[in-house]
């Protein structure tokens, strides 16, 4: 039966990509989210559609990335911002949006900036206006770290499975 | 011999690369692309040129990367464009710049998006102008499917191996 | 003992985060480092601070990674950008704003472009301005290959460990 | 419903200093900026300056920097203004306004006297 | 500085009144970027804080009412009543934000005849 002797979310997978004969053995932490587009003013992350997915003990808790076994992971993220005419009023200064994937550990009692893009874009000036923002790192992490993100300008956000996602696998 | 016993992408890698003893159980599927900076007016991925390869079973056919096994891979691209205002007129109208990597699957009819980055520009009101789109993402991806590209702003393009290329690895 | 029979840098990597059970044979050499944020005016790579670390043979030497086993690596790097205009005459002339990874090999005599990203910021018109640079791909590599970057705009980075970073890992 | 709300005003001695509030809601503030606008009693509107919650970015009236300090808190949504070496010509009404949407706040009244 | 300068300080009209304020700057408040002008006209009535009404020099705020108009480009720009309302007494002001500091006209106080 395609998936027995998985895990769960590896069943899953095989249940999903019934071509795909996964050896448990080689399966390694991975997760793809992406941001839930029913939601306009916050960013959700989903993995249960689309091409989102949790893998060997990868869950999502508190809109955080609940990192399963210690190790290496590359950890990556992609926002894209969009604007239209008119939308400034009485300003001609810059709008701010960055995008940060923060690390919450039992090491240390605060969020820790892993990943951080910014950029000023000034609306009233270019309109309609577009921005994509992507970044992504190797990092050392521990069983139970909790991987999120922090947003600036989520009003701004185009949301679409292809435009704004956040994930990690383990190395 | 060298290669002796590998696929023929591992051999070509191994001859290339004296140095590298690569047993094949540890080798993934790898592919790396890049434009091809003699096409200006189109973007057609080469494998056989520069830094780019092909390794462990990825193949190239129709400008689409061809998935050799089921797994889940880290698929990335990025590319640079360039121009210079063509007259005062530009003002009024901005640039659509965009860049896409598509999946086309025995399981859907249609080309899906798996990675998309977009950009306004303004040639008119700030010449030259320069701008860099990269993202990258893990997918669960299904033997034989296809991984291609679309962009916005062909003409556009600075066409070079560091600047414009496409990848895939098996995770 | 946490460590014993690891490398140097996966003992260290053990000590580090003493709930990780690293099998040696499972390591593989990945690589992060920050830009040192108390040199304002160059770009100097650290690995010994914040989330930055060598893992399984990679080390760094005058500002290079040394890639420690023949192999197909991925390498990634982001920069940063800010500033503020000096004076009205910057409307006038665009910045350019450039971040390339480099290779140096012994199969070449000269500093290969391995990741290229590029950007014209126009100070005069939009300040204060931010901009953020990310690229990496799968790179087929050699032992003893350095790995290097060179910056337009070193003035206007804005150094930060999640900011201004250069990573590698073996696939 | 968006509100910006000041607080802080009241009496203060020549010399002295005070800190103001802008207390933000019903919108997403770290990306826009929070003006700071001040008003003496029967006279026109100044602008003091502003501030990028989320950047930290400032901008100064050339008349006020040095005196005045612009700082935000993202997590409270809160913008201030610190003003020192205060004078009698500072009394005013302050307000705080994000350009953007063309929110302002309700003013508060800053009277320096000894 | 930008200067700003209204004119007139002060107008007495009645209700149903056609009224125009003009507002000069003392340089151009034209974007070539986009081809609009920095400007605003707020309205302030007494002990509360101002309203915009205008942005961009032409661009009426949501929920101002129709008889508000703005017009001009670069240096000289207009604030129309076109049918002066008894909640439309007030002081108005213009102001550029086309660079900085911004600032504000002097104010154009409107009375009841």
């Known amino acids: 039966l395609p998936g027995v002797g998985l895990t769960p979310s590896a069943a899953q997978t095989a249940r999903q990509h019934p071509k795909m004969h996964l050896a448990h053995s080689t399966l390694k932490p991975a997760a793809h989210l992406i941001g839930d587009p029913s939601k306009q003013n916050s960013l959700l992350w989903r993995a249960n559609t689309d091409r989102a997915f949790l893998q060997d003990g990868f869950s999502l808790s508190n809109n955080s990335l609940l990192v399963p076994t210690s190790g290496i992971y590359f950890v990556y993220s992609q926002v894209v911002f969009s604007g239209k005419a008119y939308s400034p009023k009485a300003t001609s200064s810059p709008l701010y949006l960055a995008h940060e994937v923060q690390l919450f550990s039992s090491q240390y009692p605060f969020h820790v900036p892993l990943l951080s893009s910014q950029k000023m874009v000034y609306p009233g000036l270019q309109e309609p206006w577009l921005h994509s923002m992507y970044h992504g790192a190797a990092f050392q992490l521990t069983q139970g770290d909790q991987l999120s993100t922090h947003t600036d300008g989520i009003p701004h956000l185009v949301l679409s499975p292809s435009t704004v996602f956040f994930g990690a696998f383990a190395l | 011999l060298p290669g002796v016993g590998l696929t023929p992408s591992a051999a070509q890698t191994a001859r290339q690369h004296p140095k590298m003893h690569l047993a094949h159980s540890t080798l993934k599927p790898a592919a790396h692309l890049i434009g091809d900076p003699s096409k200006q007016n189109s973007l057609l991925w080469r494998a056989n040129t520069d830094r780019a390869f092909l390794q462990d079973g990825f193949s190239l056919s129709n400008n689409s990367l061809l998935v050799p096994t089921s797994g889940i891979y880290f698929v990335y691209s990025q590319v640079v464009f360039s121009g210079k205002a063509y007259s005062p007129k530009a003002t009024s109208s901005p640039l659509y710049l965009a860049h896409e990597v598509q999946l086309f699957s025995s399981q859907y009819p249609f080309h899906v998006p798996l990675l998309s980055s977009q950009k306004m520009v303004y040639p008119g009101l700030q010449e030259p102008w320069l701008h860099s789109m990269y993202h990258g993402a893990a997918f669960q991806l299904t033997q034989g499917d296809q991984l291609s590209t679309h962009t916005d702003g062909i003409p556009h393009l600075v066409l070079s191996p560091s600047t414009v290329f496409f990848g895939a690895f098996a995770l | 003992l946490p460590g014993v029979g690891l490398t140097p840098s996966a003992a260290q990597t053990a000590r580090q985060h003493p709930k990780m059970h690293l099998a040696h044979s499972t390591l593989k050499p990945a690589a992060h480092l920050i830009g040192d944020p108390s040199k304002q005016n160059s770009l100097l790579w650290r690995a010994n601070t914040d989330r930055a670390f060598l893992q399984d043979g990679f080390s760094l030497s005058n500002n290079s990674l040394l890639v420690p086993t023949s192999g197909i690596y991925f390498v990634y790097s982001q920069v940063v950008f800010s500033g503020k205009a000096y004076s009205p005459k910057a409307t006038s002339s665009p910045l350019y704003l450039a971040h390339e990874v480099q290779l140096f090999s012994s199969q070449y005599p000269f500093h290969v472009p391995l990741l290229s990203s590029q950007k014209m910021v126009y100070p005069g018109l939009q300040e204060p301005w931010l901009h953020s640079m990310y690229h990496g791909a799968a790179f087929q590599l050699t032992q003893g290959d350095q790995l290097s970057t060179h910056t337009d705009g070193i003035p206007h980075l804005v150094l930060s460990p999640s900011t201004v970073f250069f990573g590698a890992f073996a696939l | 419903e968006v509100q910006l709300v000041e607080s802080g005003g009241g009496l203060v001695q020549p010399g002295g200093s005070l800190r103001l509030s802008c207390a933000a809601s019903?919108?997403?503030?770290?990306?826009?900026?929070i003006e700071w606008v001040r008003q003496a009693p029967g006279k026109g509107l100044e602008w003091v300056g502003e501030?990028?919650?989320?950047?930290?970015?400032?901008n100064y009236n050339e008349e006020f920097k040095g005196r005045a300090t612009f700082s935000a808190d993202n997590s409270k949504n809160t913008a201030y203004l610190q003003m020192n070496s205060l004078r009698a010509e500072d009394t005013a009404v302050y307000y705080c306004?994000?350009?953007?949407?063309?929110?302002w706040g309700q003013g508060t009244l800053v009277t320096v006297s000894s | 500085d930008i200067q700003m300068t209204q004119s007139p300080s002060s107008l007495s009209a009645s209700v149903g009144d056609r009224v125009t304020i003009t507002c000069k700057s003392s340089?151009?408040?034209?974007?070539?970027?986009?081809?609009?002008?920095?400007l605003a006209w707020y309205q302030q009535k007494p002990g509360k804080a101002p309203k915009l009404l205008i942005y961009?020099?032409?661009t009426r705020d949501s929920g101002v009412p129709s008889r508000f108009s703005g017009s001009g480009s670069g240096t000289d720009f207009t604030l129309t009543i076109s049918s002066l309302q008894p909640e439309d007494f007030a002081t108005y002001y213009c102001?550029?934000?086309?660079?900085?500091?911004?600032?504000f006209g002097q104010g154009t106080k409107v009375e009841i005849k």
């Open positions: 019903g919108y997403t503030f770290s990306s826009y900026w």
């Open positions: 340089q151009s408040l034209l974007y070539s970027t986009n081809q609009k002008n920095a």
């Open positions: 102001q550029q934000y086309y660079s900085y500091p911004r600032t």
């Open positions: 961009w020099a032409s």
């Open positions: 501030i990028s919650p989320g950047s930290g970015s400032t």
């Open positions: 306004a994000d350009g953007y949407h063309g929110y």
